[in-house]
Each structure stands twice: as C-alpha cells, then as structure tokens.
Amino acid sequence: QRLPRMQEDSPLGGGSSGEDDPLGEEDLPSEEDSPREEDPPGEEDLPGEEDLPGEEDLPEVKPKSEEEGSLKLEDLPTVEAPGDPQEPQNNAHRDKEGDDQSHWRYGGDPPWPRVSPACAGRFQSPVDIRPQLAAFCPALRPLELLGFQLPPLPELRLRNNGHSVQLTLPPGLEMALGPGREYRALQLHLHWGAAGRPGSEHTVEGHRFPAEIHVVHLSTAFARVDEALGRPGGLAVLAAFLEEGPEENSAYEQLLSRLEEIAEEGSETQVPGLDISALLPSDFSRYFQYEGSLTTPPCAQGVIWTVFNQTVMLSAKQLHTLSDTLWGPGDSRLQLNFRATQPLNGRVIEASFPAGVDSSPRAAEPVQLNSCLAAGD
C-alpha cells in the first residue's frame, strides 16, 4: 500500500518498520494542531509519547578500543509528557532503575518542556508529511543496511519500558543514509493506538496509520549517545508505518508472540535474534527525510528522520495484539503512545522520489513547490 497521494509504484505496505527515538519525544503541537503544549487528542491525532529509546533508553556505544564493543543502555534522563485528561489510559511512563531524572508520560503533567526544555524546540518530531510539498532530491540514494540479518543466538532483550516495547540491538548493525552518512543501529521500538484508533507518530496528509516502527541509530562519528544528542545528524531514525493486511507477518510475529511475557511495565524477556530488515519495508529507495527530534523527552533535535514510503503489513490480529497486550504505569494499558505532530516551522521534507507526482485524479497537475537542498552531498 502507499501513503495517501503517493505514486502508485511506491506502495506503502508490505514491509517492516523500525524507527525509534533513542531519547524521547513529547506531545507538542503539530503543524495542523494548534500550537498548544497540551494538545488534546483529536479524532485521530491523540497525543502520545512512548518510552522510545529515551535518553535513558538509548544504548551507549563504546569506542571499539574497549573490550566489549557492545551497545549498552545508557541512563539517560526521563521526563513526563503532558497528559491528556480525556485519555486516562494514555499515561504510560517509564520507570527505569537508576534513573535520577524525573519521569514523563503521555498525557497529563508535567508538560514535556518542563521535563526537557528541548521539547519546546522549533524543529520537533513527529510531523505531518505532505507529499505534494516534499522536495524531490535525487541525491537521496537507496538506504544501505548491513548486518541486520541476525542469527537466533545470541538472544535479544525485549522490554516493556512503560512507554513502548523496545528491542535492544547488538553491535554490528550498520546503516548508511548515503556516502559518509554512516550509522549503527541501537534499538527499535513501536508506537501504536488502541482499538479502532490509529497510533502512528508521523501522519501523511493528516492520515494516521495504525502503528509505526522506529529503528534508532547512532552516527559512527560518535562513540556514545550522549555525545550525539542535539548534534545535527548525531542520531538517525528509520520509521515505517504499519498497516492492516490479510496475512500474518511472520517477522513481526517473532516479537508479538512474546508480548504476553512482558505485559507488565518494566518487565523484559529474551527473544531469538531475527532478520531486523524484515521488519522494514522492502523498498529502501523511496522515502521521505527531514531533520527533527526525538519524539519523547529529552526531545533532542538534530535527529535525521527517514520515513519509508512503503508500509509494512500486519494482520488485524497482530495489530490488536500490539495495542492490547501491554500495560503501563498505574494499572493503565499501554496504548496511544504517540506524540502529536509538530509544526515544520519552515523545514522542508525531502523525498528520494518524485512524491509530488501523483497519478490519481486528485492531482491533475501536481507542482513541486520545494526544491532539493542537496542533502547527502
């Protein structure tokens, strides 16, 4: 399937997803949403913020010279996001051991900017993607992933951190956004809604998808996440929308089948290694890219977001399992863990393909209003 008003040859479906904000992202106002800090959930634009690899959740990458070249979860600060009184269940927060920072949650107090001032920044994520306004940038080459096909052993840690379900990735997963733009994958997590309510973080022309996967990466220019926070390009997230399809997605089932074991907030289990790339769409050549932030506190900016045009298909049962199995803090279900879309504030979203050209009757003579900024040169 494709994103609304996308070219027919760029289906948005049938892949996997994987993008996650290593830090966190708050429920700041979206472009379409009134710029209020506590943006009450709209029909499909419910504020949500999950425990993506938040500051505390981001693994730290140690220099190769160190004996254990493995990524470790670093104690990054956590904060609570503004709550939504209309969504009592949307208050997941992460309570990490050893975390001396304040906690945050989706909906309710404290407002995210109070938790982390960066959450009030001008270039935040997620955003609404309007393909017609995206700048076609031929310099954006197909993404390159190396080492994402993991063997079953060693096993990986799958954790309910109260904001999301997060899979910690081992060393060796390399991703390149282009020449000289190399990253290492740290973790992946998901964002979802509730029964009958979509929960993706990004939207396309106001359309919210059922769920979204984030795969969070650290630039190879940095040894640790804390060094990369707030630095342009220091972190990169691959994001993909999850949609309902007719068949079970076997790649996702390897994770979804284990959610019952980690239903309780703070619980974790181990899962066999799997092909992480199978969680993402198969088309690595068609995507949108922009610079934004973590979608949960600390909302650090400078994050390069790559949102696949193609979606990943999961069965209705799988989407239900995702949204209806986990519990957050305070005996509340972990649902609607997404942040409201944020204003672009002049940012231009780039596309690796001519997204403004639509063969549908709705766009007889599409015009590309923005020009490519030669990203990746």
Epitope: P152, L153, S250, Q270, P272
Partner: antibody, heavy 124, light 107 residues
Framework: EVQLVESGGGLVQPGGSLRLSCAAS????????MHWVRQAPGRGLEWVAF??????????QYSASVKGRFTISRDNAENSLYLQMNSLRAEDTAVYYC???????????????WGKGTTVTVSS | DIQMTQSPSSLSASVGDRVTITCHVS??????LSWYQQKPGKAPKLLIY???NLHTGVPSRFSGSGSGTDFTFTISSLQPEDIATYYC?????????FGQGTKLEIK
C-alpha cells in the same frame, strides 16, 4: 569426555509429580543452554524446555504443552539440570532426554550432546 | 509454531545407494536447521548443523543443503550401519520443532 546422565524416571499416576535429574560432565556447564527433549513411545521428538546459560541469566523457556506444569532448573555448582514435573498426564509418558545446546559461540540452537534418556510413564 | 514436514516418512534402499531426505519448513528459517540420526533404543545424534555443516566425527558420506524453507539431507553411499530414523530440526525460534522422522531401511 562430555557426558549427560539422566535419572529420576519411573511410573507415576495421573496428577502426580516427578523430578528428573541430569548430571553433566566434561564441559563448562555454565556456558551452555540446557534442554529437555522427550519422545513418546513410537513417536517423534518434542522439545520440552530449556534454561539459559550464565551469560543469559539462567532464565527458562517452556513449550506450550508443559508451561505451568513443569519447571526446569539447574544447580551450577553441582553441574546438574532438573525437570520438576507436576500435574502429570498420560500424554507426558515418554523417554526424557537431557540435551546440551547453545552457548556463547553458537549462532542458533542445535542439540549436540544427548543423554541416554530416562523413561517416565504416567498411568493409573 | 514453525511446522516441519519431512519426506518420505520411510524408505528402503540398498547398500551403496544414494539416499535423499527432504525437509520443508513452514516459514523461512535461513540456514538454522539440523539433522539427527536415531538408532532403535538409542538417543539421537547430531549429524548436520546449520543446514550443511558436518558435526565432528560424522562420516563424510552424510551431507546437507538448502536454506529458507527447503532442505535436503543426503547419504552418498548407504552403509548397513546407517539404518536409523532421521530427523530435521529448526533452531530459528522456540518452540523448537522436529520433523516427524524418516525411517530408513535396507532392502
């Protein structure tokens, strides 16, 4: 020589309990995932449970057919593996094998060392 | 759960024959497949791991191939001592599952 020796099998009534033991020798026990695999009379092989190695925290994993009834454990000081079987049913009748499989250097689960097996019969 | 389908369920061959057993898996397991030999009244023995690697001490007449969902186990020249039941097993994810077995007999 790497060796696994099971014991503890026997005849038990439905609803009863039994504890199987496995003595391991000839290898660094804590490095390995340890499994129980069973084989009903005249039937194929069925994986029952495993317990992870030291690096993975010694946590257990069970097949759906025994989850909640069987408990796998290990005594690393004694190089021993155990299977506590409660609420036994007729369909649990089988030869139970203690099996070594998976360690720090493995990239997937294969069962490279098997004990001779111990027979469990559940019958009234 | 991942389903394993072995074929044939039994076969009869002569000494010196080339024998082939196949294992079809219900989903892609890459190369995470093993083959075992079990003689009557004995415990199974590992022969092949990771689809095609010969376990230590196993005669070279045994071999394996395949990846994804279809795998093959071959005995290049059947010997009398090869009479046994052979099982495939996936080690991709738990619950670990075995094929139903192929009983090999000598003509």
């Amino acid at each position: 020589e790497v060796q696994l020796v099971e014991s503890g099998g026997g005849l038990v009534q439905p609803g009863g309990s039994l504890r199987l033991s496995c003595a391991a020798s000839g290898f660094t026990f804590t490095d390995y995932y340890m499994h129980w695999v069973r084989q009903a009379p005249g039937r194929g092989l069925e994986w029952v449970a495993f317990i992870r190695n030291k690096a993975s925290g010694y946590t257990p994993q069970y097949s759906a057919s025994v989850k909640g009834r069987f408990t796998i454990s290990r005594d690393n000081a004694e190089n021993s593996l155990y299977l506590q079987m409660n609420s036994l049913r007729a369909e649990d009748t089988a030869v139970y094998y203690c099996v070594r499989g998976g360690h720090a250097g493995s990239n997937y689960w294969y069962f490279d060392v098997w004990g001779k097996g111990t027979t469990v019969t559940v019958s009234s | 759960d991942i389903q394993m389908t072995q074929s044939p369920s039994s076969l009869s061959a002569s000494v010196g024959d080339r024998v082939t057993i196949t294992c079809h898996v219900s989903q892609n397991i890459n190369v995470w497949l093993s083959w075992y030999q079990q003689k009557p009244g004995k415990a199974p023995k590992l022969l092949i791991y990771q689809a095609s690697n010969l376990h230590t001490g196993v005669p070279s007449r045994f071999s394996g191939s395949g990846s994804g969902t279809d795998f093959t186990f071959t005995i290049s020249s059947l010997q009398p001592e090869d009479i046994a039941t052979y099982y495939c097993q996936q080690g991709q994810s738990y619950p670990f599952t075995f094929g139903q077995g192929t009983k090999l007999e000598i003509k």
